[in-house]
């Protein structure tokens, strides 16, 4: 035992940022005269949080009222502790000496630690759509909190998923923490109504974790199948061919009808039919004047389907030997028969 | 039990030096100061010195020239040495353990003279 | 220096009465809260015994009978009642400033 012992009871404390934190500190003795002091960490860079002898320390108050006579309770409260409170606090008791004050004795410190939030994950996708059986990356971000241990799920639909890659920086002890994941997920036609969640549980969060979504709507691209077929006559002398462009997504879509190569109509969707799984289905029809050909024609539905390189589906439309002889006047009318894609 | 004893030479010639030890138990000098206190025959007490656990001292500033404190804290011994002794350095010498002065040694007679 | 001042330098007290001896410091001797003065009782041929630190507090196994109260610059010990035991010299000491200085003492005699 020593003639002046320096007794800080707890050996670490724990506080949520923004709380109040107090330190314990108790002396045996007052004697020998001189005053208080505390510091964070230790040796020549140890940062001072008080001094009772002199200076301003506005997030810190005494526990006791240490003018009091006979007062040997040096406990501090450190007021809205951040992050970067953390750290080992020494309580010190210094000594008057001649000509400055001599460091006396000191407690075996406090650890403090300070719990913070993690902040709302962020979820991004990839930064160009993938069609379905490709794998895509996600990857969700998290910052500022501590302690270091966290814990991070994926899940898509519900369903954990288990090809994820996560890591928390910085590695050695530091005032927080950032978390950073990348999840890879397999695409599926089904996928434009899915989404993938990155969940964070901590300590802070008392078993109510943060969420992050992305809907996978952002990250996919279904093509369009396509399918022209000619429709029952309106008039001898006319063909009515359609095309239906189906299951496709996102909606943006460009239609173009080529008679023999040649430019006839071009479209844009606009009133299109969303199917339960999310994708589109579009129909364009085209009139043609059998009339006006002596030839068989050859038909194309051409279609660019959110900035992709087109597809197309190409059908022959035959003109009948009848109506080759006699023109306008033959009411034949013409067999249409597939032909194989341009 | 805490017990403090000093042992000097009893007499020393003037402008000779003088070398008392304190010898302690029942506590350890790494842990707490050790005082040396005199008191001349029939007059009051006169604080010369404390060496602290740490080994720093600090000293009467009337007396700091003359004046030296040291221990051995593996011996449990606290060495005053005190040079230049004239006839009103004739006093009883006391250790007194820490800033409280809350235990001392019976004293040791030291007679200045020729 | 500190000088500490004691009064009276003796005085003779009846058994069962009370004695006061009071201690004048040159300046203050309060820091943080706290008075740095200590009383101490010095029989013949014995070395001086504690009383009481820090201004009032009693050392463990002194009598009730001794007190003590004052602070800064002064400072009393009492004693009362008084007994025959207590025949001795008083000195009052201040360790808040270096060098730490002792009173001139005060000798009591119980008549």
């Known amino acids: 035992e020593d003639e002046l012992q320096v007794i800080q009871p707890e050996k670490s404390v724990s506080v949520a940022a923004g709380e109040s934190a107090t330190l314990r500190c108790a002396m045996t003795s007052l004697i020998p005269v001189g005053p208080i002091m505390w510091f964070r960490g230790a040796g020549a860079g140890r940062e001072l949080i008080y001094n009772q002898k002199e200076g301003h320390f506005p997030r810190v108050t005494t526990v006791s009222e240490l003018t009091k006579r006979n007062n040997l309770d040096f406990s501090i409260s450190i007021s809205n502790i951040t992050p970067a409170d953390a750290g080992t606090y020494y309580c010190v008791k210094f000594r008057k000496g001649s000509p400055d004050d001599v460091e006396f004795k000191s407690g075996a410190g406090t650890e403090l630690s300070v719990r913070a939030k993690p902040s709302a994950p962020v979820v991004s996708g990839p930064a160009v759509r993938a069609t379905p059986e490709h794998t895509v990356s996600f990857t969700c971000e998290s910052h500022g909190f501590s302690p270091r241990d966290i814990t991070l799920k994926w899940f898509k639909n519900g369903n954990e998923l288990s090809d994820f890659q996560t890591n928390v920086d910085p590695a050695g002890d530091s005032v927080s923490y950032s978390i950073h994941s990348t999840a890879r997920v397999v695409l599926t036609r089904g996928d434009v109504h899915s989404q993938v969640i990155c969940e964070i549980a901590h300590i802070t969060l008392q078993g109510d974790p943060l969420r992050g979504t992305a809907n996978l709507s952002e990250a996919i691209r279904v093509p369009p199948t396509l399918e022209v077929t000619q429709q029952p006559m309106r008039a001898e002398n006319q063909a009515n061919v359609t095309c239906q462009v189906s299951n496709f997504y996102p909606r943006g879509l460009q239609l173009t009808w080529l008679e023999n190569g040649n430019v006839s109509r071009t479209e844009t969707a606009s009133t299109l039919i969303e199917n339960k799984d999310g994708t589109y289905n579009w129909m364009s029809w085209l009139l043609v004047n059998t009339c006006a050909h002596r030839d068989d024609v050859v038909l194309t539905c051409q279609v660019e389907h959110d900035g992709q390189q087109a597809v197309s589906k190409s059908y022959a439309l035959e003109i009948s030997a009848h109506q080759k002889e006699h023109g306008s006047d033959i009411t034949h009318e013409a067999a249409l028969a597939p032909t194989a894609p341009l | 039990e805490v017990q403090l004893e000093e042992s000097g030479p009893g007499l020393v010639a003037p402008s000779q030096s003088l070398s008392i030890t304190c010898t302690v138990s029942?506590?350890?000098?790494?842990?707490?100061?050790v005082n040396w206190v005199r008191q001349p025959p029939g007059k009051g007490l006169e604080w010369l010195g404390i060496?602290?656990?740490?080994?720093?001292?600090d000293y009467n500033s009337a007396l700091k020239s003359r004046l030296s404190i040291s221990k051995d804290n593996s011996k449990s011994q606290v060495f005053l040495k005190m040079n230049s002794l004239q006839s009103d350095d004739t006093a009883r010498y006391y250790c007194?353990?820490?800033?409280?002065?809350?235990?001392w040694g019976q004293g040791t007679s030291v007679t200045v003279s020729s | 220096d500190i000088v500490l001042t004691q009064s009276p330098a003796s005085l003779a007290v009846s058994l069962g009465q009370g004695a006061t001896i009071s201690c004048r410091a040159s300046?203050?001797?309060?820091?943080?809260?706290?008075?740095?003065m200590h009383w101490y009782q010095q029989k013949p041929g014995q070395p001086p015994k504690p009383l009481i630190y820090?201004?009032?507090n009693l050392e463990s196994g002194v009598p009730a009978r001794f007190s003590g109260s004052g602070s800064r610059t002064d400072f009393t010990l009492t004693i009362d009642p008084v007994e025959a035991d207590d025949a001795a010299t008083y000195y009052c000491?201040?360790?808040?400033?270096?060098?730490?200085?002792f009173g001139g003492g005060t000798k009591l005699e119980i008549k």
């Open positions: 007194a353990r820490a800033g409280k002065m809350d235990y």
């Open positions: 029942g506590f350890s000098l790494t842990g707490y100061g």
């Open positions: 060496i602290w656990g740490d080994g720093s001292t």
């Open positions: 300046e203050s001797v309060d820091s943080y809260g706290n008075s740095f």
């Open positions: 820090l201004a009032s």
């Open positions: 000491q201040q360790n808040n400033e270096y060098p730490w200085t």
